[in-house]
Structure formats: structure tokens, C-alpha cells
């Protein structure tokens, strides 16, 4: 890491350090030989997050309904406003700045993890033994029914899209 | 009352290292940089770079860059300063020392050293 | 980097004397300069700060003055304890740096 010039917190202007102006407010105008770093207080939906000698606070985010956005956390002086996804949406990236509807699991697979606000469904295909007969966001594969528990035989076998089909056992005669 | 102490005297080959200790007391390590000085036998000061002991940020002089190692452990509040491949002309008395708090610093580095460490004498000599 | 240059290198004065150093730095550094005293087998000891603030404890018959590029260390009656060696340094920005050295013996 090269030397630098100041401390922490402070930047180097016509050959002498100024203090940074602290998160939440903005560079006026640089120290003197005789002043301080001069700094104001961002506006109310304005904000600055580091120690900083900039002249412009930056813009809070806007979330915008009409991206299927809504606010997760307003913003201060100090911090940017996030944003997260209505119900049923997910974000399209880390900074979410639209959304995109939950994938649903087609027939054969299951949900391994519900979406939320900032992830998408994740599907697995059904094992043996499961099944998944829908296309949902929300169900996980079943368990083929248990002929035997019901005193039935299987009819028919399971696969991974649809149930086992239980009858009834053949009466052997004598 | 404020007080810095060194480790003790080392003597060194060409080519090893050197690691000395600065033991703080009587003030709160953290809000203070801690500096590290050194003078060669009938010679001047020289500044060799900081460390902030809060943030664990640290500020080399140049001629030093890639040499020099300042840390330090806040738990027992001490500053460490490691010089790597000694040579003869790093024989020297090295101090830690404190900077001077300057609450009206408006411009400046403003690092005055108000307390100083004994020193510890390095000697490198094959 | 900024040069810091004292002079002179070394002065022979009697007890009660007026002695003066000067420090010239290579650019301007505002007020922001130190004078520190050092006796052998010593760490130095901090007399001056801000080019002119007496550090707590200093006895007021040394003073300093200046800024921009031009300074001064001054002991207005030099004392037995005053025989030393005498730096300035610079604290406008790093890497801070200290003038050679001014030597006060006894004449």
C-alpha cells in the first residue's frame, strides 16, 4: 500500500490535509490555513455513507411499484434506502433494482427452497419414491402413497409425476 | 500517568528480523496514533510511520515500504513495530511515540510526539 | 518529501546567554511544526507545538515563532539543564520529517 500524505479521515488539498466531512454530510468548501473543512447535512432524501469530500449527496434509491418494488428499509442522511420485492417477486440482482416473478417447479419436481424478496425458487427433481404432480411455487414432492399401510396392493407404479395407484388384493379361492 | 516501555535490546544478523514492543498505559490506547522514530549512532531522527491502533490502519515512509510491519493488540495495549532484512545501517535506537492530542487540529497532520518510549537499541552486526 | 533545515549545526553559549536556532522547511508547512530538546542516551522531549504553543510543563523561557517556511527556537537565558541537542519537525503532512540537529554546549 503506497504512503499517502494525511490520517484517516482526511484528504490532502493544496498541499495540506483536511479533515473528511463524516458520513451524512457533504464537502462546502476545503480547510485553510485558518479554517476547517466546511460541511452540510444532506437534504431529506439525500444521503452520503462514507467519510467523504464530496460536493453532491447522492440520491436515495427510488423504489419504484411499477417494478414490482417496495421499500425494505427507508433511508437516512447516512445510508441509502432499500428496496425489496412485492409478494410473490424476487429481485433480478444484489442491488434489486427490478423484479421478476417466482419460478414455479414443473410436474417431477419439487420445491427445495421457497423463493423470498431476493431469491428465486429452487427446484429438485422428485427421488424415487416422490412425485410431484403440479406446477407450483410451493410444494415439495410427495411420498408415493403406501399401498401395504392401507391393506391395498399397488395397481399401478409411481414415478416421479405421479402417485402410485393402490387396489384392492386378489382373494385367493379355495 | 502516561507511559510507553520498550522491549529490550537486540542484537541481529544481517538479514533477519527484528520485532520491538511498546507497551501503552495511563490513557486510552485506541484514541491515539502510535508512531514509531528511530536514530542511528550520533545521527538525527527519523520517522518511520504510524500505526492507528483503533482502526489497525498503518502509514509506511517510503523508504521503508516492504520492510516494515506496525500492529498491534489492543487486548494487552501494545504497539509492535518488524524491520525484515537487517542491514548494518539499521543499527539504531528505536522509539514508539505518542501522538500529541490536538483537539483543534482544523488542517495538518498535526503529530507532535508527547510521550516517547525509552528506546530499544537494534545492533545488527554479522 | 519536505526538507527541514537547522542552523546551525551547533552553538557555544554560557549559562545566561540568548541562543537561536532556525529551521527553514523546503515548502510551506503553516504553523505546523514542533521543537523537541534531546539529551544523550535520551528520548527526545517535546517543548513546542504549532510553532509557538509552550508544551505543558516547559519552562517559559523558550519560545518559538514562525510559519510558512521560516522558523525559530529561542532560550531567552540559557540554563545549566539547557546544554542538548534541539530538532524541529514538520507535522503538515507525512511522511513527517525532522531537521539535522542543533547541538547547545557549554562555551
Known amino acids: 500500500e503506497p504512503p499517502t500524505a494525511c490520517r484517516e479521515k482526511q484528504y490532502l488539498i493544496n498541499s495540506q490535509c483536511c479533515s473528511l466531512c463524516q458520513p451524512g454530510q457533504k464537502l462546502v468548501s476545503d480547510c485553510t490555513e485558518f479554517t476547517e473543512t466546511e460541511c452540510l447535512p444532506c437534504s431529506e432524501s439525500e444521503f452520503l455513507d462514507t467519510w467523504n469530500r464530496e460536493t453532491r449527496c447522492h440520491q436515495h434509491k427510488y423504489c419504484d411499484p411499477n417494478l414490482g418494488l417496495q421499500v425494505q428499509q427507508k433511508g437516512t442522511s447516512e445510508t441509502d434506502t432499500i428496496c425489496t420485492c412485492e409478494e410473490g417477486l424476487h429481485c433480478t440482482s444484489e442491488s434489486c433494482e427490478s423484479c421478476v416473478p417466482h419460478r414455479s417447479c414443473l410436474p417431477g419436481f419439487g420445491v427445495k427452497q421457497i423463493a423470498t424478496g431476493v431469491s428465486d425458487t429452487i427446484c429438485e427433481p422428485c427421488p424415487v419414491g416422490f412425485f410431484s404432480n403440479v406446477s407450483s411455487a410451493f410444494e415439495k414432492c410427495r411420498p408415493w402413497t403406501s399401498c401395504e399401510t392401507k391393506d391395498l396392493v399397488v395397481q399401478q407404479a409411481g414415478t416421479n409425476k405421479t402417485d402410485v395407484v393402490c387396489g384392492p388384493q386378489d382373494r385367493q379361492r379355495a | 500517568q502516561v507511559q510507553l516501555v520498550q522491549s529490550g535490546a537486540e542484537v541481529k544478523k544481517p538479514g533477519a528480523s527484528v520485532k520491538v514492543s511498546c507497551k501503552a498505559s495511563?490513557?486510552?490506547?485506541?484514541?491515539?496514533?502510535m508512531h514509531w522514530v528511530r536514530q542511528a549512532p550520533g545521527q538525527g531522527l527519523e520517522w518511520m510511520g504510524w500505526?492507528?491502533?483503533?482502526?489497525?490502519?498503518?502509514n509506511y515512509a517510503q523508504k521503508f515500504q516492504g520492510r516494515v510491519t506496525m500492529t498491534r493488540d489492543t487486548s494487552i495495549p501494545t504497539a509492535y513495530m518488524e524491520l525484515n532484512r537487517l542491514r548494518s545501517d539499521d543499527t539504531a535506537v528505536y522509539y514508539c511515540a505518542r501522538d500529541q492530542p490536538l483537539g483543534y487540529c482544523t488542517n495538518g497532520v498535526c503529530s507532535y510526539f508527547d510521550y516517547w518510549g525509552q528506546g530499544t537499541l537494534v545492533t545488527v552486526s554479522s | 518529501d519536505i526538507q527541514m533545515t537547522q542552523s546551525p549545526s551547533s552553538v557555544s553559549a554560557s549559562v545566561g546567554d540568548r541562543v537561536t536556532i532556525t529551521c527553514r522547511a523546503s515548502?510551506?508547512?503553516?504553523?505546523?511544526l514542533a521543537w523537541y530538546q534531546q539529551k544523550p542516551g535520551k528520548a527526545p522531549n517535546l517543548l513546542i507545538y504549532?510553532?509557538?504553543t509552550l508544551q505543558s510543563g516547559v519552562p517559559s523561557r523558550f519560545s518559538g515563532s514562525g510559519s510558512g517556511t521560516d522558523f525559530t527556537l529561542t532560550i531567552s537565558s540559557l540554563q545549566p539543564e539547557d546544554f542538548a541537542t534541539y530538532y524541529c519537525?514538520?507535522?503538515?503532512?507525512?511522511?513527517?520529517?525532522f531537521g539535522g540537529g542543533t547541538k547547545v554546549e557549554i562555551k
Open positions: 504549532t510553532a509557538s
Open positions: 515548502q510551506g508547512i503553516y504553523s505546523w
Open positions: 495511563g490513557y486510552t490506547f485506541t484514541g491515539k496514533y
Open positions: 519537525q514538520q507535522a503538515n503532512i507525512f511522511p513527517l520529517t
Open positions: 500505526i492507528n491502533p483503533d482502526s489497525g490502519g498503518t
